[in-house]
C-alpha cells in the first residue's frame, strides 16, 4: 500500500510529489492515474516521488498511486490537489475620494471558477491592511472608506478550490483623489490692499493647493503649503499686493498624489484705506464780506469710494492739517478754542450717484451761509479776515458716539488737500456806509 | 488611467501658424492646471505655457508671449495651443501635461512642430 | 529667471551601482522640485515631485532629497532600465526651468 501522500509544492503547471509504502522495497513500480476534468494521464515511476508538468492552471487533478510489485498490484491511494491559478494582470482603477473600484484579468481556462482575494494597503502603514475577496468568476471589486488623497497598494490573488492562491499577486499602486476644501473665507486687512483667506483643511492627505486670484485682466497664481486635517486647525494665508476696494475672484484647489480636486472658489473684495490725497488744493473766491466759495475736485476713489467730504476753513498758519482738526466747529473757533474748524459737512452717498474710479466730480460750496450739517454750522465769515480752504476726504466717516454729529478723526479713513491761497474779505459794506 | 493624446504638429514656414491640440482622458479635465513643454531635438525640455482651472488664467514663457495661445475646453476635454508669428526657434516636439503643484505629472507622447521654408 | 544647474553632465554606473545626480537653483525654490526620466524617442517620465516622494509606480531605489537650493536624486542598485536622461525642474515660480539634463549609461 502507499501512504502519506505529500503535495510537497504545487504551481500552475507542475506537482512535485511524495510518499511512503510500508517497506522497503526498492522494486516498487509505482502507477499514477492523473485525472481532470480534461481527461486522464498514465504515468509510472521506481520512485516514491514524481514531478507532474504540462498541467493545467487552476485545475483539480486526482492522482491515485498503485504500488507493484512482480505483477502484483497493492491496494491504490488517492489525493487531490488544485494547480495555482495563474497571475492576474491589467489591474485597472478607478477612484473618488474615499473609494476604488478596481477590475482585472485572468486568462486561465478555469478563471470562471477562481474567486480573487485583494489585499489593500496604506503606503507606510502595512499593519492595517484591508481584506477583500470577491464572489467566484468576479473580476472586480469596489473598495471603500479610503482615506482621500492618499496612496495605496494593492495585491490581488486569483484562488481556487480551498484557498489554493496565485504564486504571485498582481500589484497595482494608486491614489485616492483628493478632497476639496469645502470653504474658506476672506478677510479684510484692514488699511492694506490684502486679504487673509482662512480655511480648515479638508479631510485626508494633501501635497498643497493652488491658489488662483483674479479680477478683469490680472490675474495671480501661487503654491499653498499642505496642511493637515487632523486636528481641526485653521489655516490661513495673506493675499498680497492687491488694490484697495476691489473684488476678486479667487479659487483653491486641493493638490495630493499629483491629482488635483475640484476647485473652490470665493468672491471676496478688499477693504479701504484713506484715499490718496489729491495734488491740488481747493479753490476759494470772495462773495461777500462774509462769505467765501469753495470749489474743489473729488478725490481719488483708488483706496474705496469716497463718502464723505468736509471742508476745513483756518485763519491760522497753513501748515498741513490732521485729524485733530475735524473735532473743531465754528463755535469753537469763535470762542477762539481754534484757529481752524470744519464749517460744511458733504455726504456722497446722499447725492444718489455711484462715482466709478475714473469719474472726478466737481463741488462747489458756500461758506457762511449759516446752514448746519450734521454737528457742523457753516457760520458767517468775518469781514477783513484772511481765510484758506481746505478739503478732508473720508472713505470711512465715524462720528463721535458722545458728541452727537461731530467726526472722529482717529476712527474714521481721511486725507487732506493742502491749504488754499489765502483769500481776504471786504469791510462789511454797512460799517462803511454807517 | 489617465491618458494625453496631441496632435496637429507638421511642417509649417516661418511667420505662419499652427494649432495644437491635446485631447485628456482617464481624469476630471476641468480640474486640472495644465501646461505645455517643448523640446527642441536633441536639446532639453522648455515649459511654454500654462493654464488654471478655476479662472483659465493663463501664463507664457517671455520668448512666446504675443505669439502663442493656450487655451481649454473642459466640455471637450481638450488642451490647445494656437502658435502665431512661428520661427525657427519654435520648432520642437511638443508635449501637454498636467501640472499639479509646479510638478509635470503627467505627459502626452508630444507632435512634432517643424518650422523651415 | 531661476537658473537649474544639474550636475554631472554624463554618467556611467556599473548594475548593482548606487548613482547620484545633484540639481542646484539660482534662488530659493522651497520644496518645489521635480526629477524627470526620459529615454530615447519617449515622453518625459514624472519620477519625484515635490523633492521627495515618489511617483506612482516608481521603484523605491529612486528617491530624492533636498529643499531650498540644493537637492539630489539619489539611485541605489543600478539597473538597465534606468538608463536614459535624467531632469530636474523647479516648479516655484514662472517661467518654470529645467536643468541641462544628466545622461546615465549603464558601463
Known amino acids: 500500500a502507499v501512504f502519506d501522500i505529500h503535495v510537497v509544492y504545487v504551481t500552475t503547471t507542475e506537482m512535485w510529489l511524495d510518499w511512503k509504502s510500508p517497506d522497503g522495497a526498492s522494486e516498487y513500480v509505482y502507477h499514477l492515474v492523473i485525472e481532470s476534468k480534461h481527461g486522464s494521464n498514465h504515468t509510472s515511476t521506481y520512485d516514491k516521488a514524481i514531478t507532474l508538468q504540462g498541467l493545467i492552471p487552476g485545475t483539480l487533478y486526482n492522482i491515485t498511486i498503485s504500488p507493484e510489485v512482480d505483477h502484483v498490484w497493492g491496494d491504490p491511494n488517492s489525493t487531490a490537489q488544485y494547480t495555482r491559478p495563474s497571475n492576474v494582470s491589467n489591474i485597472d482603477v478607478s477612484t473618488n475620494t474615499t473609494a476604488a473600484t478596481l477590475s482585472w484579468q485572468n486568462f486561465d481556462d478555469a478563471s470562471p471558477t477562481y474567486s480573487y482575494c485583494l489585499l489593500i494597503e496604506k503606503a507606510g502603514n502595512s499593519s492595517n491592511a484591508t481584506q477583500v475577496v470577491t464572489d467566484i468568476g468576479i473580476t472586480d471589486a469596489t473598495v471603500t472608506e479610503l482615506i482621500p488623497g492618499s496612496s495605496y497598494t494593492v495585491e490581488i490573488f486569483a484562488q481556487v478550490g480551498d484557498g489554493i492562491k496565485s504564486l504571485e499577486p498582481g500589484r497595482k499602486s494608486f491614489c485616492t483623489d483628493p478632497a476639496s476644501m469645502a470653504s474658506f473665507d476672506c478677510e479684510v486687512v484692514p488699511k492694506e490692499p490684502a486679504l487673509v483667506l482662512k480655511w480648515t483643511c479638508p479631510p485626508g492627505a494633501n501635497a498643497g493647493f493652488e491658489l488662483e486670484v483674479s479680477s478683469g485682466a490680472w490675474n495671480n497664481a501661487t503654491h499653498l503649503e499642505s496642511c493637515s486635517s487632523e486636528n481641526g486647525t485653521e489655516y490661513r494665508t495673506e493675499v498680497t499686493y492687491l488694490n484697495f476696494s476691489t473684488s476678486y475672484n479667487i479659487s483653491i484647489t486641493t493638490v495630493s498624489c499629483g491629482k488635483m480636486a475640484a476647485p473652490t472658489r470665493n468672491t471676496c473684495t478688499t477693504g479701504i484705506t484713506d484715499p490718496p490725497p489729491p495734488d491740488g488744493s481747493p479753490n476759494i473766491t470772495s462773495v461777500s464780506h462774509n462769505s467765501v466759495k469753495v470749489k474743489f475736485s473729488g478725490f481719488e476713489a483708488s483706496h474705496g469710494p469716497i463718502k464723505a467730504y468736509a471742508v476745513i476753513l483756518t485763519t491760522g498758519e497753513a501748515g498741513h492739517p490732521s485729524a485733530d482738526v475735524l473735532k473743531y466747529t465754528y463755535e469753537d473757533f469763535k470762542k477762539g478754542a481754534s484757529d481752524t474748524y470744519v464749517t460744511y459737512l458733504i455726504r456722497t452717498e446722499e447725492k444718489g450717484r455711484s462715482q466709478s474710479l475714473s469719474e472726478v466730480l466737481k463741488y462747489e460750496i458756500d461758506v457762511g451761509n449759516e446752514s448746519t450739517t450734521l454737528g457742523y454750522y457753516n457760520g458767517k465769515l468775518e469781514p477783513l479776515g484772511s481765510y484758506r480752504a481746505c478739503v478732508a476726504g473720508f472713505t470711512n466717516i465715524t462720528f463721535h458716539p458722545q458728541n452727537k454729529g461731530l467726526i472722529d478723526g482717529a476712527e474714521s479713513y481721511v486725507s487732506f488737500s493742502r491749504y488754499s491761497d489765502a483769500v481776504s474779505l471786504p469791510q462789511d459794506p454797512g460799517v462803511i456806509c454807517g | 488611467e489617465v491618458k494625453l493624446v496631441e496632435s496637429g504638429g507638421g511642417l509649417v514656414q516661418p511667420g505662419r501658424s499652427l494649432k495644437l491640440s491635446c485631447a485628456a482622458s482617464?481624469?476630471?479635465?476641468?480640474?486640472?492646471?495644465m501646461a505645455w513643454v517643448r523640446q527642441a531635438p536633441t536639446k532639453g525640455l522648455e515649459w511654454v505655457a500654462y493654464i488654471t482651472n478655476g479662472f483659465g488664467s493663463t501664463y507664457y514663457r517671455d520668448s512666446v508671449k504675443g505669439r502663442f495661445t493656450i487655451s481649454r475646453d473642459n466640455a471637450k476635454s481638450t488642451l490647445y495651443l494656437q502658435m502665431d508669428s512661428l520661427r525657427s526657434e519654435d520648432a520642437a516636439t511638443y508635449y501637454c501635461?498636467?501640472?499639479?503643484?509646479?510638478?509635470?505629472?503627467?505627459w502626452g507622447q508630444g507632435t512634432l512642430v517643424t518650422v523651415s521654408s | 529667471d531661476i537658473q537649474m544647474t544639474q550636475t554631472p553632465h554624463s554618467l556611467s554606473a556599473s548594475l548593482g551601482e548606487t548613482v547620484s545626480i545633484e540639481c542646484l537653483a539660482s534662488e530659493g525654490i522651497s520644496n518645489y522640485l521635480a526629477w524627470y526620466q526620459q529615454k530615447p524617442g519617449k515622453s518625459p517620465q514624472l519620477l519625484i515631485s515635490?523633492?521627495?516622494p515618489l511617483h506612482d509606480g516608481v521603484p523605491s531605489r529612486f528617491s530624492g532629497s533636498g529643499s531650498g537650493t540644493q537637492f539630489s536624486l539619489k539611485i541605489r542598485n543600478m539597473q538597465p532600465e534606468d538608463e536614459g536622461v535624467y531632469y530636474c525642474q523647479q516648479g516655484y515660480k514662472f517661467p518654470y526651468t529645467f536643468g541641462a539634463g544628466t545622461k546615465l549609461e549603464l558601463t
Open positions: 501635461s498636467t501640472v499639479p503643484l509646479g510638478a509635470f505629472v503627467s
Open positions: 482617464g481624469f476630471t479635465f476641468s480640474n486640472y492646471y
Open positions: 515635490y523633492a521627495n
